[in-house]
């Protein structure tokens, strides 16, 4: 039985031409973790695989950095990062996990960051 | 340049164990995991499992875990695949070979090793 | 583990013609797709990475594409030196997986 919850930044905006942290926190479950896939709908930014270290995916390479810890840190955002991200926790013995984070680029200064929430 | 050198063929007998190794030169070795590859019948290939030199961390394919063992040697460069109580479906050509510079695919692979398993 | 399907074992093929394989994973892998080339008594070498990534050095008539389940990989105008078999792999979640192969002769 999965017991486990995702926590996320929740909603977040930032403005264009800086950077943000994309961070998931796993709780509630004793499942190890294997494995944290990062995607924007049906594009493929990252994997931190617990054993074999980080994978950047090239289209991204310039532009995001792993880390902290599990999460994704998105350099130099542009209007078209706007956008849902998923955070996919691969877990032995419960299975996956989704955690959902909204991100939205702002062209002005105002951008400020959303409560965190709770997926279960 | 980025050099992957495997141990010579080895013929073993039913039930013995196989050590191959794989010696690297031409990069820092500990920045790099290292897989193993199995190849069956000259086509199919299967992923046994990839070490993290710099932590010793390793990731397995549940069907080679408790047959297969992974290490390093970091003195000498050179990643070792240990497999045991070997059976016929065991013959094949073994792999090792590296991933990317934050990429999983492999980019550089070894020349192979030919296990045979024969009484 | 995630199944890397290729339905053709062997392709024949002309000189210049376009040839086009498949692989088809039985759950989504996102781009997390290679393809290798392997030549006869060689070992596998790295042509595409990321689905649609040419790795350094590789010809451009060589090209992959796909997301998710379904990825193509294209030869544009085959070469006589292209006789090889073609592995596609997914590296998306652990156990890495292959593909079949895909055994590709000159007519």
């Known amino acids: 039985m999965m017991t486990g919850t995702i926590e996320t930044t929740g909603n977040i905006s930032a403005e264009k031409g800086g950077s943000i942290i994309l961070q998931c926190h796993l709780s509630s479950t004793t499942a190890q973790v294997t494995q944290v896939n990062w995607e924007q709908q049906d594009q493929l930014l990252a994997i931190c695989n617990a054993d074999l270290g980080w994978h950047i995916s090239p289209s991204f390479k310039d532009r995001v950095a792993p880390g902290p810890g599990l999460g994704l840190t998105l350099q130099s955002l542009t209007v078209n990062d706007t956008g849902e991200y998923f955070c996919i926790y691969h877990t032995y013995p419960d299975g996956t996990y989704t955690g959902r984070i909204f991100l939205e680029v702002l062209e002005s200064s105002v951008a400020e960051h959303g409560a965190r929430f709770q997926i279960p | 340049e980025v050099q992957l050198q495997q141990s010579g063929p080895e013929l073993v007998k039913p039930g013995a164990s196989v050590k191959i190794s794989c010696k690297t030169s031409?990069?820092?070795?500990?920045?790099?995991?290292m897989h193993w590859v199995k190849q069956s019948h000259g086509k199919n290939l299967e992923w046994i499992g990839g070490?993290?030199?710099?932590?010793?961390?390793?990731s397995y394919n549940q069907k080679f875990k408790g047959r297969a063992t992974l290490t390093v040697d970091k003195s000498s460069s050179t990643a070792y695949m240990e497999l045991r109580s070997l059976t016929s479906d065991d013959s094949a050509v073994y792999y090792c070979?590296?991933?990317?510079?934050?990429?999983?695919?492999?980019?550089?692979w070894g020349q192979g090793t030919s296990v045979t398993v024969s009484s | 583990d995630i199944v890397m399907t290729q339905s053709h074992k062997f392709m024949s093929t002309s000189v210049g013609d376009r040839v086009n394989i498949t692989c088809k994973a039985s759950?989504?892998?996102?781009?997390?797709v290679a393809w290798y080339q392997q030549k006869p008594g060689q070992s596998p070498k790295l042509l595409i990475y990321?689905?649609?990534y040419r790795y350094t050095g590789v010809p451009d008539r060589f090209t992959g594409s796909g997301s998710g389940t379904d990825f193509t990989f294209t030869i544009s105008s085959v070469q006589a030196e292209d006789l090889a078999v073609y592995h596609c792999?997914?590296?998306?979640?652990?156990?890495?997986?292959f593909g079949g192969g895909t055994k590709l002769e000159i007519k």
């Open positions: 070979a590296r991933p990317g510079w934050y990429n999983y695919a492999m980019d550089y």
């Open positions: 031409g990069y820092t070795f500990t920045e790099y995991t």
């Open positions: 070490i993290n030199p710099n932590n010793g961390g390793t």
């Open positions: 759950q989504g892998v996102s781009t997390a």
């Open positions: 990321s689905a649609s």
């Open positions: 792999q997914q590296h998306y979640i652990t156990p890495w997986t």
